[in-house]
Interface confidence: medium
Amino acid sequence: TSISPGRCKWNKHTLTYRIINYPHDMKPSAVKDSIYNAVSIWSNVTPLIFQQVQNGDADIKVSFWQWAHEDGWPFDGPGGILGHAFLPNSGNPGVVHFDKNEHWSASDTGYNLFLVATHEIGHSLGLQHSGNQSSIMYPTYWYHDPRTFQLSADDIQRIQHLYGEKCSSDIP
C-alpha cells in the first residue's frame, strides 16, 4: 500500500537504507538478504545506488510494527495488510513498514519478504499500484520464485520513467 499524495521522486542517485528492527520468525541475516535483493531489483534497471547503513538516519527506513503504530495507518493482524510505504513527496518519505504479525519468510511459506519488500520499496521510490497482474506493483500478493523473479516490462517502464535507464542519467 502506498500512502500520502506525492508525485515526486528522489532527486539523487545514491539512497541509503536502514533496517531498524526485525520480525519474530526470520533470521536477521535472511531479512537483510531479502531487503538487499529487493533494492537490487530496482537498482538493476535504473541509475539508483542503494547503500545500507547500520545506524542513524537513512533515506529508506525499513521496520516491522503491529496494529496501530502512530502513523495513522494501523496494521490488522495476520493476513490482510502486509505492509505500507510512504511516497517520496509525502510527510514521511522513505518510510517502509511491514506488519510484524505476518509469517515472513524467504521461501513460499507465509509471505515472502523479498516480494513484498520489492513492492513497498517501489512505492517508496514513487511508483503507484498497477492493474497489470504481472507487475510487482499489483496490489495483491502473488508468490513468484525469488530466484527467478524479474520485473515486468510495466514495472521497468514506469521506474525508468521516473529515474531513467541504467546507463542514462535522467535524474536532474
Epitope: R7, C8, Q128, G131, N132, S168, S169, P172
Partner: antibody, heavy 119, light 110 residues
Framework: EVQLLESGGGLVQPGGSLRLSCAAS????????MNWVRQAPGKGLEWVSG????????YYADSVKGRFTISRDNSKNTLYLQMNSLRAEDTAVYYC????????????WGQGTLVTVSS | QSELTQPPSASGSPGQSVTISCTGT?????????VSWYQQHPGKAPKLIIY???KRPSGVPDRFSASKSGNTASLTVSGLQAEDEADYYC??????????FGGGTKLTVL
C-alpha cells in the same frame, strides 16, 4: 512565470519534413519531462511524443513512430520535434507541454503551432 | 484502443452539477491511477484541472472534482458557472510508454 513558445509550423507537402521548436523559460528545463500533443482542426487531443529530462528516454505514439523524432537541448532550454514523411492526417496544431515529475500529465502548455500537410 | 470514450456533449444550468464520464479498459484507466482531466476554451491551449484521478493543481476551484471506479473515470463540475463552458478531455497512462486521450466533451452552460 512558466512560458512555452512553439515555432516552426507551416504548410508542407505530403512526404515532406518540418522541424518544430519549443522555447522554454521560467523553470529549470533540464528537470522536467516534455511532451508534444497535437489537435487536428475541430478534433480532440492526441499525445504524440514524450522525452525524459536528460533526453535519454523517448516515447512515441504508434501513429508517428518511425517518422517523428523528439529531442531536446537543455543548454538552450529548447524542445524539438523533427517530422518526416508527413501525411495529410498529421495536419494539426502542435502543442509543447511540460510534464509533471512523473511525466504522465502536462501542467503547462504552449499556445501551439499549426502544421498543414497539403498538396 | 486508440481513444478513451467520452460523451460528446453535456450541459447544465448555472449553479447545477454536471458529471462527465471517461471510459477506458483494464489496460489504461482501470490499470493505473494516472488519469488526468484538461479544460480547453475555444482557441486556447488546454489547462490541467485534475491529475492522478482526483487531485487538483493549485488555483483550480474545488468545484472541480473527480473519481474513478473500475475502468471509468468521472469529472464533476458543481455550482456551474458561465466560464466553465469549454471542452473537457480525459487522459490516461496506457502502459507500454503511451498516453491516451478521450475524444472530448463539450460542456454547455445553459
Amino acid at each position: 512565470e512558466v512560458q512555452l513558445l512553439e515555432s516552426g509550423g507551416g504548410l508542407v507537402q505530403p512526404g515532406g519534413s518540418l522541424r518544430l521548436s519549443c522555447a522554454a523559460s521560467g523553470f529549470t528545463f533540464s528537470q522536467y519531462w516534455m511532451n508534444w500533443v497535437r489537435q487536428a482542426p475541430g478534433k480532440g487531443l492526441e499525445w504524440v511524443s514524450g522525452i525524459g529530462p536528460s533526453g535519454g528516454i523517448t516515447y512515441y505514439a504508434d501513429s508517428v513512430k518511425g517518422r517523428f523524432t523528439i529531442s531536446r537541448d537543455n543548454s538552450k532550454n529548447t524542445l524539438y520535434l523533427q517530422m518526416n514523411s508527413l501525411r495529410a492526417e498529421d495536419t494539426a496544431v502542435y502543442y509543447c507541454a511540460r510534464g509533471e515529475e512523473d511525466g504522465y500529465n502536462s501542467d503547462y502548455w504552449g499556445q501551439g503551432t499549426l502544421v498543414t500537410v497539403s498538396s | 484502443q486508440s481513444e478513451l470514450t467520452q460523451p460528446p456533449s453535456a450541459s447544465g444550468s448555472p449553479g447545477q452539477s454536471v458529471t462527465i464520464s471517461c471510459t477506458g479498459t483494464s489496460s489504461d484507466v482501470g490499470a493505473y491511477n494516472y488519469v488526468s482531466w484538461y479544460q480547453q476554451h475555444p482557441g486556447k491551449a488546454p489547462k490541467l484541472i485534475i491529475y492522478e484521478v482526483n487531485k487538483r493543481p493549485s488555483g483550480v476551484p474545488d468545484r472541480f472534482s473527480a473519481s474513478k471506479s473500475g475502468n471509468t473515470a468521472s469529472l464533476t463540475v458543481s455550482g456551474l458557472q458561465a466560464e466553465d463552458e469549454a471542452d473537457y478531455y480525459c487522459n490516461s497512462y496506457a502502459g507500454s510508454n503511451s498516453l491516451i486521450f478521450g475524444g472530448g466533451t463539450k460542456l454547455t452552460v445553459l
